[in-house]
Amino acid sequence: SPYSSDTTPCCFAYIARPLPRAHIKEYFYTSGKCSNPAVVFVTRKNRQVCANPEKKWVREYINSLEMS
């Protein structure tokens, strides 16, 4: 289960290899209390994967999730 303080998961590293978009069902942003800003993608198998919100490909994934 996600490591947290205040029950909010924080990310300490980011994924480098992008997953196929069709396998990502939702996302959320980690808390502003976390030391690293992060987007957490949730896969269809309910695994959580940390991604860097500054990356263009991450923003494009978020946009496609918002539109679907």
Epitope: P2, Y3, S4, P9, C10, C11, F12, A13, Y14, I15, A16, R17, P18, L19, P20, R21, A22, H23, T30, A38, V40, T43, R44, K45, R47, Q48, V49, C50, K55, K56, W57, V58, E60
Partner: antibody, heavy 129, light 113 residues
């Protein structure tokens, strides 16, 4: 340190199939993807396809679609690459390689480098009549 | 034809500096996918040399460094040594709705004069 050990060299006839295995000491965690990369004599590296357990999917480079199948055994300790309808230009060294894909929330003390960080020793496949 | 473009060969004298370029497009490097670099010594499997654009795995000398900007990346080797003579490959990604492909450059042969 995880090791990837591949099956031995193969000599095949044109039109036949080859199946190469890649055994991971300690098994393949679903935090990792397993790719197959080939290298024809004197040529560069060519990614063929890979298995990503995290999302339970296998995908193939477009030029191998329909001719290549990548599978894993039930224990997730061995991954197989089967290439069908072999031609002489499939003569190459075939490598399996591991890559970290899952970085979840929480401590990352066991995190290794990104990229293809562990490679098998390679399996030479010769296609000749 | 490789998706990422590298010079086929570069050379340099011992002690000197060489750089190897890797050029992609908006659908790969330009989409902010990370670049990894590999060294392949003759008769050996490739070895990860640089990951996430500029990070060296443990054991890789500081003489090797990487950088990335926009649709191009580069590998720099300073203080060239005879044992650096090898093939070097850049690698990144290209994704779609149902695919996540690994892509390589065509490789660059480094000759130490």
């Amino acid at each position: 340190q995880v090791q990837l050990v591949q099956s031995g060299a193969e000599v095949k006839k044109p039109g036949s199939s080859v199946k190469v295995s890649c055994k991971a000491s300690g098994g393949i965690s679903d935090n990792y993807a397993l790719s197959w990369v080939r290298q024809a004599p004197g040529q560069g590296l060519e990614w063929m396809g890979g298995f990503i357990p995290l999302v339970d999917t296998t995908n193939y480079a477009q030029r191998f679609q329909g001719r290549l199948t990548i599978t894993a055994d039930d224990s997730m300790s061995t991954v197989y690459m089967e290439l069908r309808s072999l031609r002489s230009d499939d003569t190459a060294m075939y490598y399996c390689a591991r890559e970290q894909v899952a970085v979840g929330p929480g401590p990352t003390s066991d995190r290794g480098p990104d990229g293809l960080d562990v490679w098998g020793q390679g399996t030479m496949v010769t296609v000749s009549s | 034809q490789s998706v990422l473009t590298q010079p086929s060969s570069v050379s340099g004298a011992p002690g000197h500096r060489v750089t190897i370029s890797c050029t992609g497009s908006n659908s790969n490097l330009g989409a902010d996918y990370d670049v990894h670099w590999y060294q392949q010594l003759p008769g050996s499997a490739p070895k990860l040399l640089i990951y996430d654009n500029n990070i060296r795995p443990s054991g890789v000398p500081a003489r090797f460094s990487g950088s990335k900007s926009g649709t191009s990346a580069s590998l720099a080797i300073t203080g060239l040594q005879a044992e650096d003579e090898a093939d070097y490959y850049c690698q990144s990604y290209d994704t779609g709705l149902t695919s996540s492909d690994v892509i390589f450059g065509g490789g660059t042969k480094l000759t130490v004069l």
